[in-house]
C-alpha cells in the first residue's frame, strides 16, 4: 500500500493510508469536509506560457520498486491529451495552456498496473487539477449597443436602463470577476450606479424638443475599479420619449380664404394648421369652431395624417346674400398630460376669413315646374299662361325665353320671348292627349352660355264635343212565340269625353221609328236601356229581321246626340226559348229584311 | 512496426539440451518482457516463464523449473531459452511473444522441436 | 494454478449467425475492476492472435465483430455474424496470477 506524503500534511490531523501518492502542484492542505480530507487536488496556474510542458506533480505507489515493472496510467478528463503521464515515472504534465474559463476543473483518474500482468496494484484513484485563476478577461457587456428611452422632463433619478457586464473570471477568487460600473460619456444628463449597472437621469427638464437623443458610454472595470483592472466599455443610445408638455400654436393670428359661391356641401375651401413640438399622439390636434357668423355655414375636420384643420362648406353659399364671413378656429390637444396644465391652456385660436365669390349663374325660374290648364275648344293663339325667370347674380340680365323643341315636336305651344307668355299655335284635342309636357328655356340675352329649363305641364281640360255612341254593335234576335213587352236586349253606351260631374245618357226610339214600331225602348236612366217586343208573335216568314233606329243623348252642354241600329232577327226556337233557326224561307218572301221595326 | 523471429525447426536427440532464440526489433526491447509458450501438436498452450531484459529478471511455471532457463542478450535484443535433457515430451512448437500488461500481443511464428534418436 | 475450462470442445455454427465460447475460472481473474482475461484466435501452422483483451477491450485491427464480456470467474466470447475466415481454434487466457493459463481450446466450424 501507498500512503500520502505527512511531510505535506498540515500537522495534528490524522494520515489516511492511500495507495497512491500524490507530490508536486498540489495543496495538501486539509479542508474540513462532512465525511472525509480532501487531500487529492493539485492546482495548476492558468494560461502558462512556459516553453515546456508545464509539471503537474507525480503519482507514485509504495509498489514501485523502480525496475520498471510498473506502468502508470492516467484516465479521465483530458487524458493523453491535455495530461500526459510518464508511464514508468508517474510524472504528470499538462501539455497545452489551460484555460479556467474553459474548464476550471478536471478530474482524473490514475492507477498503476504491473506491467507484466496487467494487474493492478491498488484501486483506481481519483483526484483532482483545478486551475487557478488569473485576471486575463476583461468584463463583457451582455450586449455592445444597448437602447433605452426614458421620458422627457423625467425627475432626476428615474430608471432609464441596467447594463450588465459579466467577467469570465472566477468570482470566488480575488477580485478579477468583480466589476465596477463608470460612465465615460454621457454627464452631466445620466449617471450609472457603480454596483448595479444602472442608469438613471441626472438632470432636471431634459426636453426632448431641444434634444432628443443622447449616447452613452459605459465602462465596465474588474478588480473592483482598482489600477491595473481590465476593462470593457458598450455603449448605451438613450432616446427621450415624448411627454405633451408643448401646446399648439397657430403660426398666424388671421387666415383668409376664397370660395366660390357654387360650392356644394362638404368642399374643402381651406387648410389651416397649428404647430405642436411635441410628437405622436401628443401632437394630435382637434380643430372646432367656435365662434362667429360662419359658424353654420362651415365646417372644420381634422386630417388625420397631416394634423390640419381641413375649412369646409356646410351649406349652400349665396354671394348676393352674403359676401363675408369670419370664423374662430380652435386647435387642441385631445390627450393632455396633467402634470403640464400649469404651461397654460394647451389650445390655441385664428381668425378664419372667408370671402364668397361671385359666379355667373344661370337664370332661376319663379317656380321649379308649372302646372297649367287650358280648354280644349281654346282658339288658336290662346294664351295659356306665363313663366318667369331671373338673372340671380347681381348684373340682372335680361333673359330670353323659348320652348324646347324636342318636348314639343308638332309646335302646338309657343312664348313670349320677352315675357314669357305661353300660347296656343294650333288646336287643341283632350281626346287624342289629356297631359302636354315641354320645357321653357331662359336664357341671358348677354350671355347665351347661361341658360336654364323649367318643365311645364299643360293639362286640356273637357269640352263636350263627342257624342255618346252604342259601346258595341247590337244583333238580337227575337222568337216567333215571343210573348210581348219581353226583353230582348240591354244597350249600353260609351262617350270620349269626360264631364266633370260624369256621363248621363238618355236612350229612345228615333222619331221617324217610334209610331207603330213592333218594339219598345225602355231607358233604364244608368245609362242603359233595355229592347223590349210590343206584341204577341212574330213571324219570320213574313218579316225575318227589323232595324231598330235607336237615338243616345248626353246632357251635358251642349248636348251631343247620334243614332245607332239595333238588328233584330226572328228565329224559330224550341220550347225553352233556345233559337232554331233564324233564316227565312227562300222564294217565298223575298223581300225578308224591313227597316219598319 | 514490432516483430519477433524464431528459427523454423530444431532437430536434436533425447538427452541432449537445445537453446532456441528470438530476435525482437520495433521496440524497446529493454523495456517489455519476453515470455515463452509450448504447443503441442493437436494441443492446448502452456506458459514457461518470462523474462525482463532491463534486468534479467524472471518468473517460471514451476512446472518447467529443471526444464527451461531464460536468458536475453541486449546487444543483439536476442532472448533464448535452454532446454535440457530433452525427451519425446519436449517435442513441441516453441513460440516467444510479449506480454503486455498481461496479454500476448506479439508472437514470433513459432520453432518446432523434434527430439528423435 | 488456475485453470480455465473451456466449452463447447468445438461448434459448427452458420455463416451469419452468432458463435458464443464460454470460458470458467477456477478462481476469479478480476481485481479493482480489471478483469485479467484475454481471447486469442489460432489458425493452423500460425501462432495465436490476440482478439480480447481484459475480458472486453478488442484489440485494434481485430473487426467489431469480435466482442468479450464477463467479470470474475465466467467470461464469453461472441462472434457475430460469423464470417468464413472465422473457422480457428480459439482460447481464453488469464494474467491474474503466475503461472498464466490457457484454456484447452474451441474449435470453430463454419457450416
Known amino acids: 500500500t501507498l500512503s500520502t506524503p505527512l511531510s505535506k500534511r498540515t500537522s495534528g490531523f490524522p494520515a489516511k493510508k492511500r495507495a497512491l501518492e500524490l507530490s508536486g502542484n498540489s495543496k495538501n492542505e486539509l479542508s474540513r469536509s462532512k465525511r472525509s480530507w480532501m487531500w487529492n487536488q493539485f492546482f495548476l496556474l492558468e494560461e502558462y506560457t512556459g516553453s515546456d510542458y508545464q509539471y503537474v506533480g507525480k503519482l507514485h505507489s509504495d509498489q514501485d520498486r523502480g525496475d520498471g515493472s510498473l506502468k502508470y496510467i492516467l484516465s479521465g478528463d483530458g487524458a493523453g491529451d491535455l495530461f500526459i503521464i510518464n508511464e514508468n515515472t508517474g510524472d504528470i504534465q499538462a501539455t497545452k495552456r489551460l484555460d479556467r474559463e474553459e474548464k476550471p476543473v478536471y478530474i482524473l483518474r490514475a492507477q498503476a498496473i504491473n506491467r507484466r500482468t496487467g494487474r493492478p496494484v491498488e484501486p483506481e484513484s481519483e483526484f483532482i487539477i483545478k486551475i487557478h485563476d488569473i485576471n486575463d478577461n476583461e468584463p463583457i457587456f451582455t450586449k455592445e449597443v444597448y437602447t433605452a428611452t426614458v421620458p422627457e422632463m423625467s425627475d432626476v433619478g428615474t430608471f432609464v436602463v441596467q447594463v450588465t457586464a459579466t467577467d469570465a473570471d472566477d468570482p470566488t477568487y480575488g477580485n478579477s470577476a468583480k466589476v465596477v460600473y463608470s460612465i465615460l460619456q454621457g454627464q452631466p444628463y445620466f449617471s450609472v450606479e457603480s454596483e448595479t449597472g444602472i442608469i438613471k437621469t441626472a438632470l432636471l427638464n431634459m426636453d426632448r424638443e431641444n434634444r432628443e437623443q443622447y449616447q452613452v458610454v459605459i465602462q465596465a472595470k474588474d478588480m473592483g475599479g482598482q489600477m491595473g483592472g481590465l476593462s470593457g466599455t458598450t455603449t448605451v443610445n438613450i432616446t427621450l420619449t415624448d411627454v405633451n408638455d408643448n401646446p399648439p400654436r397657430f403660426p398666424q393670428s388671421t387666415y383668409q380664404f376664397k370660395t366660390p359661391e357654387s360650392s356644394p356641401p362638404g368642399t374643402p375651401i381651406g387648410r389651416i394648421k397649428a404647430s405642436d413640438a411635441d410628437v405622436g399622439e401628443n401632437a394630435e390636434i382637434e380643430y372646432s369652431i367656435t365662434d362667429g357668423e360662419g359658424l353654420d355655414m362651415f365646417d372644420v375636420i381634422t386630417d388625420q395624417e397631416t394634423q390640419e384643420g381641413i375649412i369646409t362648406v356646410k351649406k349652400l353659399l349665396d354671394f348676393e346674400k352674403k359676401k363675408v364671413y369670419t370664423l374662430k378656429v380652435e386647435a387642441s390637444n385631445p390627450h393632455v398630460e396633467p402634470r403640464f396644465l400649469y404651461l397654460g391652456p394647451f389650445k390655441d385660436s385664428a381668425t378664419v376669413r372667408i370671402v364668397v365669390e361671385d359666379v355667373d349663374e344661370p337664370p332661376v325660374f319663379s317656380k321649379l315646374a308649372y302646372i297649367l290648364q287650358i280648354r280644349e275648344d281654346a282658339q288658336i293663339n290662346t294664351t295659356i299662361g306665363s313663366v318667369t325667370a331671373q338673372d340671380p347674380d347681381a348684373a340682372r340680365n335680361p333673359v330670353k325665353y323659348s320652348v324646347d323643341r324636342h318636348t314639343d315636336m308638332d309646335r302646338i305651344f309657343n312664348i313670349d320671348s320677352g315675357n314669357g307668355s305661353i300660347f296656343t299655335s294650333k288646336l287643341l284635342d283632350r281626346e287624342t292627349l289629356l297631359w302636354h309636357n315641354i320645357t321653357v328655356i331662359a336664357t341671358e340675352i348677354n350671355n347665351p352660355k347661361q341658360s336654364s329649363r323649367v318643365p311645364l305641364y299643360i293639362k286640356v281640360l273637357d269640352v263636350n264635343d263627342n257624342a255618346p255612341e252604342f259601346a258595341e254593335f247590337y244583333e238580337t234576335f227575337v222568337c216567333e212565340k215571343a210573348k210581348a213587352d219581353q226583353l230582348i236586349q240591354t244597350l249600353r253606351a260609351v262617350d270620349k269625353d269626360d264631364p266633370y260631374s260624369g256621363h248621363q245618357f238618355s236612350f229612345s226610339l228615333a222619331p221617324e221609328a217610334a209610331s207603330g214600331s213592333n218594339f219598345t225602348i225602355q231607358d233604364n236612366k244608368d245609362n242603359t236601356a233595355g229592347i223590349l217586343t210590343r206584341k204577341n208573335g212574330y213571324n219570320r216568314h213574313e218579316m225575318s229581321t227589323y232595324l231598330l233606329p235607336v237615338v243616345i243623348s248626353d246632357n251635358d252642354y251642349p248636348v251631343q246626340s247620334s243614332t245607332g241600329t239595333v238588328t233584330v232577327r226572328v228565329c224559330a226556337c224550341d220550347h225553352h226559348g233556345n233559337m232554331q233557326s233564324c233564316h227565312a224561307e227562300a222564294l217565298i218572301h223575298p223581300t225578308g229584311l224591313s227597316t219598319g221595326a | 512496426q514490432v516483430q519477433l523471429q524464431q528459427p523454423g525447426a530444431e532437430l536434436v536427440k533425447p538427452g541432449t539440451s537445445v537453446k532456441m532464440s528470438c530476435k525482437a526489433s520495433g521496440y524497446t526491447f529493454t523495456s517489455d518482457w519476453i515470455a515463452w509458450v509450448k504447443q503441442r501438436p493437436g494441443q492446448g498452450l502452456e506458459w514457461i516463464g518470462d523474462?525482463?531484459?532491463?534486468?534479467?529478471?524472471?518468473h517460471n511455471n514451476e512446472k518447467f523449473n529443471f526444464k527451461a532457463t531464460l536468458t536475453v542478450d541486449t546487444s543483439s535484443n536476442t532472448a533464448y531459452m535452454q532446454l535440457s535433457s530433452l525427451t519425446s515430451e519436449d517435442s513441441a512448437v516453441y513460440f516467444c511473444?510479449?506480454?503486455?500488461?498481461?496479454?500476448?500481443?506479439?508472437w514470433g511464428q513459432g520453432t518446432t522441436l523434434t527430439v528423435s534418436s | 494454478d488456475i485453470v480455465l475450462t473451456q466449452s463447447p470442445a468445438s461448434l459448427a455454427v452458420s455463416l451469419g449467425q452468432r458463435a458464443t465460447i464460454s470460458c470458467r475460472a477456477s478462481e476469479s481473474v478480476s481485481i479493482h475492476g480489471t478483469h485479467l482475461m484475454h481471447w486469442y484466435q489460432q489458425k493452423p501452422g500460425q501462432p495465436p492472435k490476440l482478439l480480447i483483451y481484459a475480458a472486453s477491450n478488442l484489440e485494434s485491427g481485430v473487426p467489431a465483430r469480435f466482442s468479450g464480456s464477463g467479470s470474475e470467474t465466467d467470461f464469453t466470447l461472441n462472434i457475430h455474424p460469423v464470417e468464413e475466415e472465422d473457422a480457428a481454434t480459439y482460447f481464453c487466457q488469464q494474467s491474474f496470477e503466475d503461472p498464466f493459463t490457457f484454456g484447452s481450446g474451441t474449435k470453430l466450424e463454419i457450416k
Open positions: 523474462i525482463y531484459p532491463g534486468s534479467g529478471r524472471t
Open positions: 511473444a510479449r506480454p503486455m500488461l498481461g496479454r500476448f500481443d506479439y
